[in-house]
């Protein structure tokens, strides 16, 4: 019973996802004290970000609606030190952050992290201003890492009659135009909870009109063809679904993709069992279906994106969201999203406060980073279908795509299967005809060290994954399997399998 037969549907792609399907975010709270944006100047962080290109970098979060651009604001001493240290260099071949500045900021970061998390839990948000230097820092990080910046604008700046006040956005657009910064835009974050956060209720129709106003601003600027995404609502519970519907009716015409957010759990109460529970993983399915129902009933054909998503809200679950255990949720969400037709999934966060980051405060990559990197290298944009034969086996979850054609090791027609084993025994996967005797490369991820699933280090096919140096990612070495052998997937592990020479015409 530990041998499992798979079924594939490869006649034609179910969906086509974006080359930037797996994308990342920087939470806007990083700009609460703009000095900490200097971390984005780290060459190591940029190397890690470059590994995930092509991808979007969304700058957004609750703080989006409490940030105000002040073009006259002076840079901090630390920011000036950073920019001065870069003066004689190619902006993208950045030298390190000045050591004294980095040391000072690192020592202050744990306190700042607590400030940000406390603000979040107490739902008491204060306005902060950010300067031209902050915008430069963000844009340079994205641009030098090969990421496309999506900038979230403050939607809580309102006139007396609750229309959106676009004057601050205009200042930012003018500055970005002057610097020839090419980026996309959002307006507001989780507007469904504005009442809770700011004692202001904005209905979906009003928000739709606000988006039209922003679109008009963009058309008048050098951003004539800039993309606009929204409304970044939370999970589609009744009132939020209604808000999304009325928003799309009023303003759906001007957005390029519909964005919504999803978290499985509350970070304060989540348990290891939750992270490994197929019932928890499956709740995502109904949320996706609900969003698609709303879109189909108002703006059919409009692309749907997960504009912010992770395992647990509130910064993640301590000792869980940054461990190997988080990978089950992350990989399953990627698989389900692709299978159900979501075009882009933005992971909260690439780097920043909390526990759900891909890269920690020392700029060291965590298990979900390595999982994301493998996904980028191996998984293509054409989505196919794999399923487990026989009775429903929700503890064994399988997904199938054409292999990434940008990977020089593989060729058009190859297949990438990725699988998650939530059983406590090894499962052996058997490929269907005509693939069972093909050469297969295995990329098995398992935790390293005594902490097991709660480890923050990971092995690929038995080799520990770590950076070669600050500028170099390690090679991701495959393990070729004997043709015709079943694909072993140990208990509580996940793996990619590339089926070579599959010659699938749909790919």
């Amino acid at each position: 019973q530990d041998v499992v037969d798979l079924d594939f549907f490869t006649q034609q792609p179910l969906h086509l996802v974006s080359p930037s399907f797996l994308s990342v975010t920087i939470d806007a709270n990083l700009a609460t004290d703009p000095r900490f944006l200097i971390f984005l100047g780290s060459p190591k962080l940029r190397t890690l970000a470059r590994g995930l290109s092509p991808a979007y970098l969304r700058f957004g979060g609750t703080k989006t609606d409490f940030l105000i651009f002040d073009p006259k604001k002076e840079s901090t001493f630390e920011e000036r030190s950073y920019w001065q240290s870069q003066v004689n260099q190619d902006i993208c071949k950045s030298g390190s952050i000045p050591p004294d500045v980095e040391e000072k900021l690192r020592s202050e970061w744990p306190y700042q992290e607590q400030v940000l998390l406390r603000e979040h839990y107490q739902k008491k948000f204060k306005n902060s201003t950010y300067s031209r230097s902050s915008v430069d820092m963000l844009y340079t990080f994205a641009n030098c890492s090969g990421l496309d910046l999506i900038f979230g604008l403050n939607a809580l700046l309102r006139t007396a009659d609750l229309q959106w006040n676009s004057s601050n956005a205009q200042l930012l657009l003018d500055y970005c135009s002057s610097k020839r910064y090419n980026m996309s835009w959002e307006l507001g974050n989780e507007p469904n909870s504005f009442l809770k956060k700011a004692d202001i209720f904005i209905n979906g129709s009003q928000l739709g009109e606000d988006f039209i106003q922003l679109h008009k601003l963009l058309r008048k600027s050098t951003f004539k063809n800039a993309k606009l995404y929204g409304p970044d609502v939370g999970q589609p519970r009744r009132k939020t679904a209604e808000m999304l519907k009325s928003f799309l009716k009023a303003g759906g015409e001007v957005i390029d993709s519909v964005t919504w957010h999803h978290y499985y759990l509350n970070g304060r109460t989540a348990t290891e069992e939750d992270f490994l529970n197929p019932d928890v993983l499956d709740i995502f399915i109904s949320s996706v279906q609900k969003v698609f129902q709303v879109v189909e009933s108002t703006r059919p054909g409009k692309k749907v994106w997960l504009g912010e998503t992770s395992s647990a809200y509130g910064g993640g679950a301590p000792l869980l969201s940054d461990t190997f255990a988080a990978g089950f949720m992350w990989l399953d969400k990627l698989g389900l999203s692709a299978r159900m037709g979501i075009e882009v999934v933005m992971r909260q966060v690439f780097f920043g406060a909390g526990n759900y980051h891909l890269v920690d405060e020392n700029f060291d990559p965590l298990p979900d980073y390595w999982l994301s990197l493998l996904f980028k290298k191996l998984v293509g944009t054409k989505v196919l279908m794999a399923s487990v034969k026989g009775p429903k086996r929700r503890n064994l979850r399988v997904y199938l795509h054409c292999t990434n054609t940008d990977n020089p090791m593989y060729k058009e027609g190859d297949l990438t299967l990725y699988a998650i084993n939530l059983y406590n025994v090894t499962k052996y996967l058997r490929l269907p005809y005509p693939f069972f005797d093909k050469q297969v490369d295995k990329y098995l991820l398992r935790p390293l060290g005594p902490h097991g699933l709660l480890s923050k280090a990971v092995q690929l096919n038995g080799q520990t994954l770590k950076m070669v140096d600050d500028q170099t990612l390690p090679p991701l070495m495959e393990k070729p399997l004997r043709p015709g052998s079943s694909l072993g997937l140990p208990a509580f592990s996940y793996s990619f399998f590339v089926i070579r020479n599959a010659k699938v015409a749909a790919c």
């Epitope: 229309q163 009109e209 039209i212 009716k249 015409e253 189909e296 059919p300 054909g301």
Partner: antibody
Framework: QVQLQESGPGLVKPSQTLSLTCTVS??????????WSWIRQHPGKGLEWIGF???????FYNPSLKSRITISVDTSKNQFSLKLSSVTAADTAVYYC??????????????WGQGTMVTVSS | SYELTQPPSVSVSPGRTASITCSED??????AYWYQQKPGQSPVLVIY???ERPSGIPERFSGSNSGNTATLTISGTQAMDEADYYC?????????FGGGTKLTVL
């Protein structure tokens, strides 16, 4: 270059159902994500939007006509159709099929059929 | 319900500027579109998204939209511009047309 051509009977009796078809040539009805529309114009009067359909079958109708309209699509024939039930003399008009100028912008039409005159009379 | 109001007729001398208005509460919060229709012909889109001109439409056609009013302006009006003009907007999943304005070139 996409072209649209309306077809159907020019005369319909009161209380019957008006049926028109729009044939799309020069492009596929199911590519590009366009909303395919019906618009009418009463003699000597202005334009009135009837409704539109997406290739997946999702429809949107003018609220004032909603109870009498059915718009359907046949991707295999590259056609979409209008049915208007319980017609009266007030439904006498030139009926146009139209397509928006862009797949993102549903409400502005840059490709129109030449129109077909439908008279409701016994 | 949403109604776009246009003057029934506007007259202009050749070479002068003609302005046709389209009104509705907070129309400036939406995008306005304009069509030209000559007798016996199908409508032609002349302005989209308030002020954009489709390819092939002469530069003398321009548009604006703010407050409660969208305006179609034809500068240096020519005899060939004599036609009916319709404004149009999108309101909550429905398309709404104005009643039309007959432009007469004197």
């Amino acid at each position: 270059q996409v072209q649209l051509q309306e077809s159907g009977p020019g005369l319909v009796k009161p209380s019957q159902t008006l049926s028109l078809t729009c044939t799309v040539s020069g492009g596929s009805i199911s590519s590009g994500g366009y909303y395919w529309s019906w618009i009418r114009q009463h003699p000597g009067k202005g334009l009135e939007w009837i409704g539109f359909i997406y290739y997946s079958g999702s429809t949107f109708y003018n609220p004032s006509l909603k109870s009498r309209i059915t718009i359907s699509v046949d991707t295999s024939k590259n056609q979409f159709s209008l049915k208007l039930s319980s017609v009266t003399a007030a439904d006498t008009a030139v009926y146009y099929c139209a397509r928006p100028y862009s797949s993102s912008w549903y409400g502005a039409f840059d490709i129109w059929g030449q129109g077909t005159m439908v008279t409701v009379s016994s | 319900s949403y109604e776009l109001t246009q003057p029934p007729s506007v007259s202009v001398s050749p070479g002068r500027t003609a302005s046709i208005t389209c009104s509705e509460d907070k129309l400036g919060n939406k995008y306005a579109y304009w069509y030209q229709q000559k007798p016996g012909q199908s409508p032609v889109l002349v302005i989209y998204q308030d002020s954009e001109r489709p390819s092939g439409i002469p530069e003398r056609f321009s548009g604006s939209n703010s407050g409660n009013t969208a305006t179609l302006t034809i500068s240096g009006t020519q005899a060939m511009d004599e036609a009916d003009y319709y404004c149009q907007a999108w309101d909550s999943s429905t398309v709404v047309f104005g009643g039309g304005t007959k432009l007469t070139v004197l």
